[in-house]
């Protein structure tokens, strides 16, 4: 079982100066050093901040089930307890096909698995949506036109990693919320610098998480209840150098929907996320579809 002992403070004085400098410095990539100030964790300060068992970050990448780390707050032990010996990744024979046919309006049962991204919900048109709270915001170092050209592949791969369904959030006009990302500029810059045309260096992508099939699967205790927990999971994968996603991410975060939702009581560290998750799971299940809508 994970020890519940205090993490050491950052052992290297040099790491203080390296925090948040956009370089992942291996020697500073630890919880005590804040994952190099977020440089190694996609700017997520501490992906495991809600996890009471303090050693779960060490066990996250060991491909063994550590029950004390299998809670949502501990990022499901990287799904090590959930896999149950089954294949953890989409069958390579299907993967390209599933990416090409993701959310194309036709149900492909071979792709309708969590590890293949649930076929973009093509097999779940009659099942009501069950959205996780908030919006998952990714900054991708790819201009919007390029990212949108490969949108099906992008969403399929991300859905497969998170083992649930991802889709672009749509604006009032039904357009995908994918915006140009310009470098953030300090306010006190000289006039000459302000006059430079802003360089588009990526895209800000707003995503919704739809747990309708995740919550229907036999082991339905591993769905992300909110966008921030999904962002924490992606940050954790990045921190342990196991994020197999071919789109370069600058950062990830969860944002509440506008207008701000009322805060949930008991949302502190540790058990807070569990409480929120349990409450939402009851809500999801009560509003869930009748059994005959399941697609297997």
């Amino acid at each position: 079982a994970p020890e519940v002992s205090e993490e050491p403070r950052c052992p290297r004085a040099a790491c203080q100066a390296k925090r948040g400098d956009q370089r992942c410095d291996r020697e500073c990539n630890s919880p005590g050093c804040g994952w190099d100030g977020g440089d190694c964790s996609l700017s997520v300060g501490d992906p495991w901040r809600q996890c009471e068992a303090l050693q779960c970050w060490r066990l996250f990448n060991n491909s063994r089930c550590d029950p004390a780390c299998s809670s949502p707050a501990c990022l499901y032990d990287n799904f090590d307890c959930h896999a149950g010996g089954r294949e953890r990744t989409c069958n390579p024979v299907y993967e390209k096909y599933c990416a090409d046919h993701f959310a194309d309006g036709r149900c492909d049962q071979g792709c309708n698995t969590e590890e293949c991204g649930w076929d973009g919900l093509d097999c779940a048109s009659e099942v009501p949506a069950l959205l996780a709270r908030g919006v998952l915001v990714l900054t991708v170092l790819l201009p919007p036109e390029e990212l949108l050209r490969s949108s099906a592949d992008f969403l399929q791969r991300l859905s497969a990693i998170l083992r649930t369904s991802l889709r672009f959030r749509l604006d009032a006009h039904g357009q995908a919320m994918v915006f140009p990302y310009h470098r953030p500029s300090p306010g006190s810059e000289p006039r000459a610098r302000r006059e430079l045309a802003p360089e588009v260096i990526g895209s800000v992508v707003m995503l919704e998480i739809d747990n309708r099939l995740c919550l229907q699967s036999p082991e339905n205790d591993h769905c992300f209840p909110d966008a921030q927990s999904a962002a924490d999971y992606l940050g954790a994968l990045s921190a342990v150098e196991r994020l197999d996603f071919p789109y370069p991410l600058r950062d990830v975060r969860g944002e509440p929907l506008e207008p701000p939702e009322p805060s949930v009581p008991g949302g502190g560290s540790g058990g807070g996320l569990n409480d929120i998750f349990e409450a939402q799971k009851i809500e999801w299940h009560e509003g869930g579809p009748p059994h005959h809508h399941h697609h297997h």
């Epitope: 100066a17 390296k18 370089r23 470098r183 430079l196 197999d244 071919p246 789109y247 600058r250």
Partner: antibody, heavy 119, light 107 residues
Framework: EVQLVESGGGLVQPGGSLRLSCAAS????????MTWVRQAPGKGLEWVAE????????NFNEKFKGRFTISVDNAKNSLYLQMNSLRAEDTAVYYC????????????WGQGTLVTVSS | DIQMTQSPSSLSASVGDRVTITCKAS??????IAWYQQKPGKAPKLLIY???NRYTGVPSRFSGSGYGTDFTLTISSLQPEDFATYYC?????????FGGGTKVEIK
């Protein structure tokens, strides 16, 4: 338009010193890490060192630590490489390049400046 | 430090050929690989970043693939202007090592 222009190369005797410069224009200089890469005649590319104009942080190829120093002058949008105790094997074309955010691929390079170390 | 090993070091091919160059990292580097093309007397040019993303303006005949330790640069149909030397480079963590290069020559 992003432009990087190196200067300062030339002939120097073994044991001597040389300071290379790279003038950057067309973008916000402090926003990007800057790098030196070198290439000996007929050989491959070799990463030397990088610096963040914003934080002053540096990373070096261990091979060059102690002999080479990387620095910037943000007021001049310029990058420098101070090379001391030069050896014949330091003969190479030295390129400056702009490292892209977080991952450090090099989309923009200078034209290179040739350093020849010979007696 | 992680080493990047390219193969072959040189190859001869004809216009229209499909050419594959490999780069092997001594440890897992995820997707953190870039590919460059260099012609004699010129600075390198970025072709592919983050293993599989084509840089702006790079022709679609160039593609990159791989994850972890094994990476491939493929030129689907070699053009006269593609005869050059190609390098892989490790991204994300210092040191940002380059592979030894692959020279593509005319057969």
């Amino acid at each position: 338009e992003v432009q990087l222009v190196e200067s300062g190369g030339g002939l120097v005797q073994p044991g001597g010193s040389l300071r290379l410069s790279c003038a950057a224009s067309g973008y916000a200089f402090t926003d990007y890490w800057m790098t030196w890469v070198r290439q000996a005649p007929g050989k491959g590319l070799e990463w030397v060192a990088e610096i963040s104009p914003n934080s002053g942080g540096t990373n070096f190829n261990e091979k060059f630590k102690g002999r080479f120093t990387i620095s910037v002058d943000n007021a001049k949008n310029s990058l420098y490489l101070q090379m001391n105790s030069l050896r014949a094997e330091d003969t190479a074309v030295y390129y400056c390049a702009r490292g892209e955010i977080r991952y450090n691929w090099f989309a923009y390079w200078g034209q290179g400046t040739l350093v020849t170390v010979s007696s | 430090d992680i080493q990047m090993t390219q193969s072959p070091s040189s190859l001869s091919a004809s216009v229209g050929d499909r050419v594959t160059i490999t780069c092997k990292a001594s440890q897992n580097v995820g997707n953190n690989i870039a590919w460059y093309q260099q012609k004699p007397g010129k600075a390198p040019k970025l072709l592919i970043y983050y293993a599989s993303n084509r840089y702006t303006g790079v022709p679609s005949r160039f593609s990159g693939s791989g994850y972890g330790t094994d990476f491939t640069l493929t030129i689907s149909s070699l053009q006269p202007e593609d005869f050059a030397t190609y390098y892989c480079q490790r991204l994300y963590n210092s040191p940002f090592t380059f592979g030894g290069g692959t020279k593509v020559e005319i057969k």
